[in-house]
Amino acid sequence: KAMHVAQPAVVLANSRGTASFVCEYASPGKATEVRVTVLRQADSQVTEVCAATYMMGNELTFLDDSICTGTSSGNQVNLTIQGLRAMDTGLYICKVELMYPPPYYMGIGNGTQIYVIDPEPCPDSD
């Protein structure tokens, strides 16, 4: 009764520094409350990028100052991370927790390598 989490291996951020990917989980139970966390792994350090708890069938609500937005559909979560720069290139891991009802389950994806390329500054025009 393990929970498997799938996410794409690679995603390229657009020119505005926005990257989107789908995090899909195979639920071993019928959860009504789910928490999704995006973690960034750099070297051996893992830090939280953003997190949202949602009731099945409802929208994800990230904190107001979050760089993430998302929507959910069944066992799929569509995640968007904004404001990325080249230095933010790295492995972004999707963690899913089935919070309620019991039992609790946790699943962690293998990570999505997000590549961010800073746009070239526009040349000055005379």
């Epitope: 393990a2 973690l39 997190a51 963690k95 039992p103 389950y105 946790m106 699943g107 962690i108």
Partner: antibody, heavy 118, light 106 residues
């Protein structure tokens, strides 16, 4: 650096109550699930309870369900364990532990000793 | 509830020797950790996700296995490695620990 410091242990008679505290520092407390784990003298580790993030979701070991209550005050960076109807078999060192980003218990306190005896 | 059974209960070895500790689960486990505990000290996380070393853990410690059979290997025992080792599953509630393996000096 991450620090977890437990307090509130002591000697108590069977049937009585005790409240343990765990003061956390060095990290954003509200972002982490927090566990209580106990260890009877000379025995192994036994998971007791967990409380998640905002405090709404809690889980308990069958051995303490209905008697122990886990809670947290994120404004005070403090975790609690209210222990009622204590039994001799609850005698143990009680430690709080942080659930790390990837799930395992990455930081532990040194523990506070609870002795239930008449 | 997932029951974790560790073997052997006690391992008597000399410094420099290789230690192999086993943890067997009553059903398939997705997320397994290993902890080290010395007398009078809190447990210390060694391995998570069955095979990933925690921050600051020397590379003589390695974890392997999947499903129901897991192994912690200490390639060359140092004097400070003599302690009790616990496995734990953390992928679902209730969180459970093995009963521990004591690694003692022969």
């Amino acid at each position: 650096q991450v620090q977890l410091v437990e307090s509130g242990g002591g000697v108590v008679q069977p049937g009585r109550s005790l409240r343990l505290s765990c003061a956390a520092s060095g990290f954003t407390f509200s972002r982490y699930g927090m566990h209580w784990v106990r260890q009877a003298p000379g025995k192994g580790l036994e998971w007791v309870a967990v409380i998640w993030y905002d405090g709404r979701n809690k889980y308990y070991a069958d051995s303490v369900k209905g008697r122990f209550t886990i809670s947290r005050d994120n404004s005070k960076n403090t975790l609690y364990l209210q222990m009622n109807s204590l039994r001799a078999e609850d005698t143990a060192l009680y430690s709080c532990a942080r659930a790390g980003e990837l799930g395992p218990f990455d930081y532990w306190g040194q523990g506070t000793l609870v002795t239930v005896s008449s | 509830e997932i029951v974790l059974t560790q073997s052997p209960g006690t391992l008597s070895l000399s410094p420099g020797e290789r230690a192999t500790l086993s943890c067997r689960a009553s059903q398939s486990v997705s997320y397994l950790a290993w902890y080290q505990q010395k007398p009078g000290q809190a447990p210390r996380l060694l391995i998570y996700g069955a095979s990933s070393r925690a921050t600051g853990i020397p590379d003589r410690f390695s974890g392997s296995g999947s499903g129901t059979d897991f192994t912690l290997t200490i390639s060359r025992l140092e004097p400070e490695d003599f302690a009790v080792y616990y496995c734990q599953q953390y992928g679902s509630s209730p969180w459970t620990f093995g009963q521990g393996t004591k690694v003692e000096i022969k």
